[in-house]
């Protein structure tokens, strides 16, 4: 088992909004749960966009999940990762 490296980034979206993207990379096996939480509970699926789980060329895999949020509310969102029984949560950078 190779645990993922998880990285959260933010980018400008429409006025007053930002897109936050959570990327998991260099993990094996390919089964992974990656999702955004808002206020500590699941963020509805229709407000998230997922990338495919793709090989990254090193025998491991990568994927991502993104959502659009209001600027100033970043604290309310965390990216949750589960892989091979390991869990971690990742905040949006300031």
């Amino acid at each position: 088992t190779v645990p993922p490296m998880v990285n959260v980034t933010r980018s400008e979206a429409s006025e007053g909004n930002i897109t936050v993207t959570c990327r998991a990379s260099s993990f094996y096996p390919r089964n992974i749960a990656l999702t955004w939480r808002q206020d500590g509970v699941s963020l509805s699926h229709d407000t998230q966009q997922w990338g495919d789980v793709l090989p990254d060329g090193n025998g491991t895999y990568q994927t991502w999940v993104a959502t659009r949020i209001c600027r100033g509310e970043e604290q309310r969102f965390t990216c949750y990762m589960e892989h091979s029984g390991n869990h971690s949560t990742h905040p949006v950078p300031s």
Partner: antibody, heavy 119, light 107 residues
Framework: DVQLQESGPGLVKPSQSLSLTCTVT?????????WNWIRQFPRNKLEWMGY???????NYNPSLKSRISITRDTSKNQFFLQLISVTTEDTATYYC????????????WGQGTLVTVSA | DIQMTQSPASLSASVGETVTITCRAS??????LAWYQQKQGKSPQLLVY???MLADGVPSRFSASGSGTQYSLKINSLQPEDFGSYYC?????????FGAGTKVEIK
């Protein structure tokens, strides 16, 4: 360490309002987290009532929405529960707690305060 | 609302025994589950979060598992301090709801 302490009257008459205070020490309620009220009925059933978060946003249990209000006094680092039009069914031990945004579980609770609704 | 059904409602066990408590959700909660222990006259204490993760300071005789709608809490070699009530709580969506509890008593 975050510490929470509930206070308020132990006896409330039916049809009146129940008002409780949670005093938080060791952490500023405006820094982060969701600050919650949870109650436990005499037969031990637990009910999440609602929260006010670090920015003042509230979220209530729909079963209580018409009767509940959670507010705060940031200068005293306190948050409050008001429940109007109480009945004997609101007799319970009331707890304040908080959760972090990595997940809505409750790592620490106040010691609880028993409120009896009776004429 | 997601309803949480715990079983059994109570059980009697001896020190050293293994006990298992189960919690069923009325919908898939995707491991968004916590477990608490409550002693008589005290506040609940967090035992488990994210369905399987032990909270800080929780002894390793406690373990938790499950997925989808079915979850369980197992206590290996029950100790005198383990007697009390246990509650599950989901945090998949609002409103957050708890199970009705399982009371673990001394046989």
């Amino acid at each position: 360490d975050v510490q929470l302490q509930e206070s308020g009257p132990g006896l409330v008459k039916p049809s009146q309002s129940l008002s409780l205070t949670c005093t938080v020490t060791g952490y500023s309620i405006t820094s982060d987290y969701a600050w919650n009220w949870i109650r436990q009925f005499p037969r031990n059933k637990l009910e999440w009532m609602g929260y006010i978060n670090y920015s003042g946003t509230t979220n209530y249990n729909p079963s209580l929405k018409s009767r509940i209000s959670i507010t705060r006094d940031t200068s005293k680092n306190q948050f409050f529960l008001q429940l109007i039009s109480v009945t004997t069914e609101d007799t319970a031990t009331y707890y304040c707690s908080y959760y972090r945004y990595d997940g809505a579980w409750f790592p620490y609770w106040g010691q609880g305060t028993l409120v009896t609704v009776s004429a | 609302d997601i309803q949480m059904t715990q079983s059994p409602a109570s059980l009697s066990a001896s020190v050293g025994e293994t006990v298992t408590i189960t919690c069923r959700a009325s919908g898939n909660i995707h491991n968004y589950l916590a477990w608490y222990q409550q002693k008589q006259g005290k506040s609940p204490q967090l035992l488990v979060y994210n369905a399987i993760m032990l909270a800080d300071g929780v002894p390793s005789r406690f373990s938790a598992s499950g997925s989808g709608t079915q979850y369980s809490l197992k206590i290996n070699s029950l100790q005198p301090e383990d007697f009390g009530s246990y509650y599950c709580q989901h945090f998949w969506s609002f409103p957050l709801t708890f199970g009705a509890g399982t009371k673990v008593e001394i046989k």
